[in-house]
């Protein structure tokens, strides 16, 4: 059960949102909806797995309601008509709080996990292969919707690996309600990989602001800086690394380093004081020649959120910012598997790292 190609995540899409699920639903597909329940207006939100954009054919309607003590409705809509509701009378969501909502498509049902605990299973009433669209509406703000394609599961899966894993790419920032992720580069078939999503949470009461998101006073996922993590298996052609975060309003510089032992194989260094994105390699504490050319203006902006996708290819790294290809960096250290450490530091707040 191996599927090639990958679906780009939708980053900070506006709600109401509708987006295409490339290739439709597959047995083993995992879809993660990450966001925050709005604390103000509205008592409901919904995630729909549907055919097309009309909303008349919804294979799975997942509908938390902050009414009557809180409950979640699950249902199916066929030709505009709703079937019998299935209600779960426990509410795992909290108003004003972030959530991590994961859907696993399986042959007999959808399994739904909320905040790390299995919440409900919803048995298919219509063939799930018909589903080609995900929509989200209601009193919710989205951080991202990501997709992990089914993969052959190891006989003895370790707890720290992903059984259904595939590198993903960032699309351009969503601009409309109906979005089809074009992908930045062609999605090449990739080998079975481990994808590790590193997640942390900031201290309660921390202010966190992005252009699309008003300041919020709840614990928002954010990383201690500097952030250092291992890249399991190191780099290899088709390996993807994804980061998202927010540039601090007073930022001078930040850096993303891919390291091999004491060497920095790839140093990505946006400098706001120079209005430049500097790239370089450091070997035995000696820097090489800088690369600074860009096809367009500086993509990082003080006070604004960003996403970076680093795709390793045989001869170079391809780097995209906010879904747009920015530059290629030809390998100077060519022993790719030894490049196995990611270091991020400087004047940013990280919100998502996937290696």
């Amino acid at each position: 059960m191996a599927f090639s190609g990958s679906q780009a995540p939708y980053l900070s899409p506006a709600v109401p949102f509708s987006g295409t699920i490339q290739g439709g639903l597959q047995d083993g597909l995992q879809i993660t909806v990450n966001g925050t329940v709005l604390s103000s207006s509205g008592t409901r939100f919904a995630v729909n797995f549907q055919t097309g954009f009309s909303g008349n054919d919804i294979a799975f309607h997942f509908n938390p309601r902050f009414e009557d003590g809180g409950y979640v409705v699950c249902n199916t809509r066929q030709n505009g008509s709703w079937g019998p509701e299935e209600r779960k009378t426990h509410m795992p969501f909290q108003k004003g709080m972030p959530f991590d909502l994961c859907f696993l498509v399986q042959s007999s049902d959808f399994k739904v996990m909320v905040n790390g605990i299995l919440f409900v299973q919803y048995f298919h009433r219509v063939p799930f292969h018909r589903v080609d669209t995900i929509s989200v509406n209601g009193s919710v703000q989205l951080s991202y919707i990501s997709f992990q394609n089914p993969r052959t599961v190891p006989v003895q899966p370790a707890f720290s690996t992903v059984p259904f894993s595939q590198p993903v790419c960032f699309p351009p920032r969503p601009r409309g309600r109906r979005q089809k992720p074009p992908g930045v580069w062609p999605a090449n078939p990739a080998p079975i990989t481990q994808t590790v999503i590193h997640t942390v949470q900031s201290a309660p009461g921390q202010m966190f602001s992005t252009p699309a998101i008003p300041p919020m006073m709840y614990p928002h996922p954010a990383y201690p800086m500097p952030f250092i993590t291992t890249i399991l298996g190191g780099l290899y052609p088709s390996k993807s690394i994804l980061l998202s975060g927010t540039v601090l309003p007073s930022a001078q510089r930040f850096h993303i380093n891919l390291c091999s032992g004491n060497h920095i194989a790839f140093h990505l260094n946006p400098r706001f004081d120079e209005n430049a994105v500097v790239r370089n390699t450091q070997i035995d504490n000696s820097w090489g020649s800088e690369e600074r050319s860009l096809p367009r203006k500086m993509p990082f902006v003080r006070g604004q959120s960003f996403s970076v996708w680093i795709l390793c290819e045989a001869h170079c790294l391809k780097v995209a910012v906010d879904g747009q290809h920015l530059f290629e960096y030809y390998h100077r250290l060519r022993n790719l598997p030894t490049i196995n450490r990611l270091e991020v530091g400087g004047d940013i707040q990280l919100t998502h790292v996937q290696t």
């Epitope: 709080m97 972030p98 909320v114 299995l118 059984p163």
Partner: antibody
């Protein structure tokens, strides 16, 4: 190597407070849900609370709701259990355990446990 | 709350015996069930996760199965180191998202 180490247990009078710590190594607490489970002398396992640091979500057993607070400091890679208004029936060995990492969330089980810390509530 | 009714509460068996322990959930919990082994003075150890998957490093004589809301832990050939207490545990979101069975003490006959 993944490891969980509890500390902070001890003897406390009824109505008193204790704060238990669960220091993690070999993984980040933010990529898992962290649970506290207790075991009274000669009794079975009882789930107490959990935190999913990625979203900040917490949940408690009815028996401790309003008295215990679970939290996590991701910069210290440590989870905590603040226990207030302690009662004699809270006497137990308290374990922290890791439940399914973020990246393998469809795997259901607590794969790593600490050695436990004894809390005795007695006058 | 979802109740996990575990039986028997204790059993006596000999080395080489086939041992079966069952847990019945009071409502559907999908496959979100794990089995643990605990020895006196020690923390529990995970044996089976997701109802039927053998955890890494656990001997293959341990197996788990599911039939509806009934879950079974089987030790195909009991070994001396297997004398311990065994617990089932469900993690399906309810008022208490985690509940354990009462435990089964496996003793030497």
């Amino acid at each position: 190597e993944v490891q969980l180490v509890e500390s902070g247990g001890g003897l406390v009078q009824p109505g008193g407070s204790l704060r238990l710590s669960c220091a993690a190594s070999g993984f980040t607490v933010s990529s898992s849900s962290i649970h506290w489970v207790r075991q009274a002398p000669g009794k079975g396992l009882e789930w107490v609370a959990y935190i999913y640091p990625y979203s900040g979500y917490t949940s408690y057993a009815d028996s401790v709701k309003g008295r215990f607070t679970i939290s996590a400091d991701t910069s210290k890679n440590t989870a905590y259990l603040q226990m207030n208004s302690l009662r004699a029936e809270d006497t137990a060995v308290y374990y922290c355990a890791r439940y399914s990492t973020y990246s393998s969330k469809w795997v259901w089980g607590m794969d790593y446990w600490g050695q436990g810390t004894l809390v005795t509530v007695s006058s | 709350d979802i109740q996990m009714t575990q039986s028997p509460s204790s059993l006596s068996a000999s080395v080489g015996d086939r041992v079966t322990i069952t847990c019945r959930a009071s409502q559907s919990v999908s496959s979100a069930v794990a089995w643990y082994q605990q020895k006196p003075g020690k923390a529990p150890k995970l044996l089976i996760y997701s109802a039927s998957s053998l955890y890494s490093g656990v001997p293959s004589r341990f197996s788990g199965s599911r039939s509806g809301t009934d879950f079974t832990l089987t030790i195909s050939s009991l070994q001396p180191e297997d004398f311990a207490t065994y617990y089932c545990q469900q993690s399906y979101y309810d008022s208490n998202p985690i509940t354990f069975g009462q435990g089964t003490k496996v003793e030497i006959k």
